[in-house]
């Protein structure tokens, strides 16, 4: 399986959200910072963020070139040895989300709540619709908190 160890500060674990068609990593030597061992194949140089290996590294030391990830569909935000980029997140409108920042080759999509939706957790995977008040509003709905409604029969000063 893909190792959960990081090789060094610049080269991170590639077992990440949406990483496509990855080669299984069988061994990772944390002392060995020159490369990564893939099924008897050895990569010496990682690809920078936004790029991937054009193909898997070979046992004879042939080092594939790095090629760009597909803009708007894939990304890698760290240096890595994989021949595939990660899949960009979709901001699912069915979960009350919309795109805040589009996916680039080096950064995953950033989502936010759609208008009239809110989310009160730190990481928003789902936003809920703001409550509609029948008897008036105490506090408007924001991106991070629901509407506060007046109770029936309450007076406004």
């Amino acid at each position: 399986r893909l190792s959960s160890k990081s090789v060094n500060a610049q080269v991170t674990d590639i077992n990440s959200k949406g990483l496509e068609l990855r080669k299984t990593v069988t061994t990772v030597e944390t002392q060995n910072l020159e490369g990564l061992h893939h099924d008897g194949q050895f990569c010496h140089k990682p690809c920078p963020p936004g790029e991937r290996k054009a193909r898997d590294c070979t046992v004879n030391g042939d080092e594939p070139d790095c090629v760009p990830c597909q803009e708007g569909k894939e990304y890698t935000d760290k240096a890595h040895f994989s021949s595939k980029c990660r899949r960009c997140r979709l901001c699912d409108e069915g979960h009350g989300l919309e795109v805040e920042i589009n996916c680039t080759r080096t950064q995953n999509t950033k989502c936010r709540c759609k208008p009239n939706f809110f989310c009160n957790s730190t990481v928003c995977e789902h936003c809920d619709p703001c409550t509609k008040c029948e008897h008036g509003i105490i506090k408007e709905c924001t991106l991070t908190s629901n509407t506060k409604c007046k109770e029936e029969g309450s007076r406004s000063n």
Partner: antibody, heavy 121, light 111 residues
């Protein structure tokens, strides 16, 4: 309500091609990727590939590259899956399914009723 | 490819029984605390139906007797009290890595 309606069963000869349609309704077609899944008789489910209807970007399971071609017609909210050079092992029920994303976990929430493709000489 | 192995392949149970189906992945389908595992139900001649997404989230409209749990390589679908309409085949599916793969299915039959 959200619905995916697929075209009817097809019987084809080996070597022929077939195009299965999947008409979406009840949601914004271009907002959700469409997935395609194969189920051979008495067998399990096999993911074939996906298409983003907003720009026709496709991503295939390597096993189906060259076998399946995914397209969309946004004017009619219809997705298509064409199978070429048909062989007996392509005999299966083919499903389209709407893709959803929960923090990069992609899953299939609404499925078409399936289209049986039979390849027989 | 990630191989998903479901167990048992089939089981016989009675209405009211608690049923547990397991799905074991050949490598972890987790990242950053999230598990990329989904569960579907399929009845003969019908399309699959989503039950659980992201390991433990119940799909809207699915009865609360269905629940999902697990992380890493080991996942479980539980039906707390089996109902007549629950006799079907159940599939797990991972979306952490392409190609997305399904388990071979678990057939739940009437005892």
């Amino acid at each position: 309500q959200v619905q995916l309606v697929q075209s009817g069963a097809e019987v084809k000869k080996p070597g022929a091609s077939v195009k299965v349609s999947c008409k979406a309704s009840g949601y914004t077609f271009t907002s959700y990727w469409m997935q395609w899944v194969k189920q051979a008789p008495g067998q399990g489910l096999e993911w074939m590939g996906e298409i983003d209807p907003s720009d026709s970007y496709t991503n295939y399971n390597q096993k189906f590259k060259g076998k399946a071609t995914l397209t969309v017609d946004t004017s009619t909210s219809t997705a298509y899956m064409e199978l070429s050079s048909l062989r007996s092992e392509d005999t299966a029920v083919y499903y389209c399914a709407r893709n959803r994303d929960y923090s990069n976990n992609w899953y299939f929430d609404v499925w078409g009723q399936g289209t049986l493709v039979t390849v027989s000489s | 490819d990630i191989v998903l192995t479901q167990s048992p392949s089939s089981l016989s149970a009675s209405v009211g029984d608690r049923v547990t189906i397991t799905c074991k992945a050949s490598q972890s389908v987790d990242y950053d605390g999230d598990s990329y595992m989904n569960w579907y139900q399929q009845k003969p001649g019908k399309a699959p139906k989503l039950l659980i997404y992201a390991a433990s989230n119940l799909e809207s409209g699915v009865p609360s007797r269905f629940s999902g749990s697990g992380s890493g390589t080991d996942f479980t679908l539980t039906i707390s009290s089996l109902q007549p309409e629950d006799f079907a085949t159940y599939y797990c599916q991972q979306s952490n890595e392409d190609p997305r793969t399904f388990g071979q299915g678990t057939k739940v039959e009437i005892k």
